[in-house]
Amino acid sequence: MMTGTIETTGNISAEKGGSIILQCHLSSTTAQVTQVNWEQQDQLLAICNADLGWHISPSFKDRVAPGPGLGLTLQSLTVNDTGEYFCIYHTYPDGTYTGRIFLEVLESSVAEHGARFQIP
């Protein structure tokens, strides 16, 4: 029985050239988090494994930093970074929880953070 919920930073925007923190938080479960994947639909960005530590995809090594916590920091943003990002929590014994974040990278200097929302 999966009782947990994932809270994410929701829909967020940031300026081109800037940085952004992608953050998810798993709550309402006592399940043990054994691995967290950060992914786009076509490729994996990073993995934080409880035993192995962090793995950052070579494609992103220059501008992705692990953390804070289980989150991920994207740096030197370009408009091509606009899109959906997913945190995938592998847990025991519950299974897999997924959170979704939509990032919009703006050319202008006006970049507001969206509201937080929950994905069950």
């Epitope: 992914e39 639909q41 994996l44 793995h55 959906e84 997924t98």
Partner: antibody, heavy 117, light 107 residues
């Protein structure tokens, strides 16, 4: 429970276009997941062809990019494969499969396609 | 493309045996490997994802391990219904790629 069912012509002549349909029941293709086409050649080699995700965007195997198109009809909960300029090398069993982050987790039963004149 | 190499096309086993199938990726894929089972006349079925996580409903005699480039799939107590071809697959990036498969046969 989700079910995927492939349908197609069975036999296609060389240089023609191939069109296959995957009908999905028990899950909306616009809700989540990537909806894949994967083929298995005689001799059992598996090749991922491409997918269309719930939002409608597509990703294709570069080896097929000039010949392939994956589309969908959300009103019928179907997605389609079109492969142009087929040759005998395209003879295979074609599977549609549901997947999450490049992990096909539920496959249809497959449809056999022969390319022959 | 990432090439997935399964060194054994066939492996002989006996019922009750512990059998391990290996797979090697051409580059570091961290833990982004899945294992699929294909029984004769059937479509493939995912058993393991992210190297070691069992898919829903998969018996616990099936386990996966490994990271980086080397991966192992193990059946701890071989049953007759486990006779099948097993494929590794990387889910690190597109294009998805599969190993050539390892067919388990009875001695």
């Amino acid at each position: 429970d989700v079910q995927l069912q492939e349908s197609g012509p069975g036999l296609v002549k060389p240089s023609q276009s191939l069109s296959l349909t995957c009908t999905v029941t028990g899950y909306s293709i616009t809700s989540d997941y990537a909806w894949n086409w994967i083929r298995q050649f005689p001799g059992n080699k598996l090749e991922w062809m491409g997918y269309i995700i719930y939002s409608g965007s597509t990703s294709y195997n570069p080896s097929l990019k000039s010949r392939i198109s994956i589309t969908r009809d959300t009103s019928k909960n179907q997605f389609f494969l079109q492969l142009n300029s087929v040759t005998t090398e395209d003879t295979a069993t074609y599977y549609c499969a549901r997947g999450w982050f490049r992990r096909p987790d539920y496959w249809g039963q497959g449809t056999t396609l022969t390319v022959s004149s | 493309d990432i090439v997935m190499t399964q060194s054994h096309e066939f492996m002989s086993t006996s019922l009750g045996d512990r059998v391990s199938i290996t797979c090697k990726a051409s580059q570091d894929v961290s833990t982004a490997v899945a294992w699929h089972q294909q029984k004769p006349g059937q479509s493939p079925k995912q058993l393991i994802y992210s190297a070691s996580y069992r898919y829903t409903g998969v018996p616990d005699r099936f386990t996966g391990s490994g990271s980086g480039t080397d991966f192992t799939f193990t059946i701890s107590n071989m049953q007759a219904e486990d006779l099948a071809v097993y494929y590794c697959q990387q889910h690190y990036s597109v294009p998805l790629t599969f190993g050539a498969g390892t067919k388990l046969e009875l001695k």
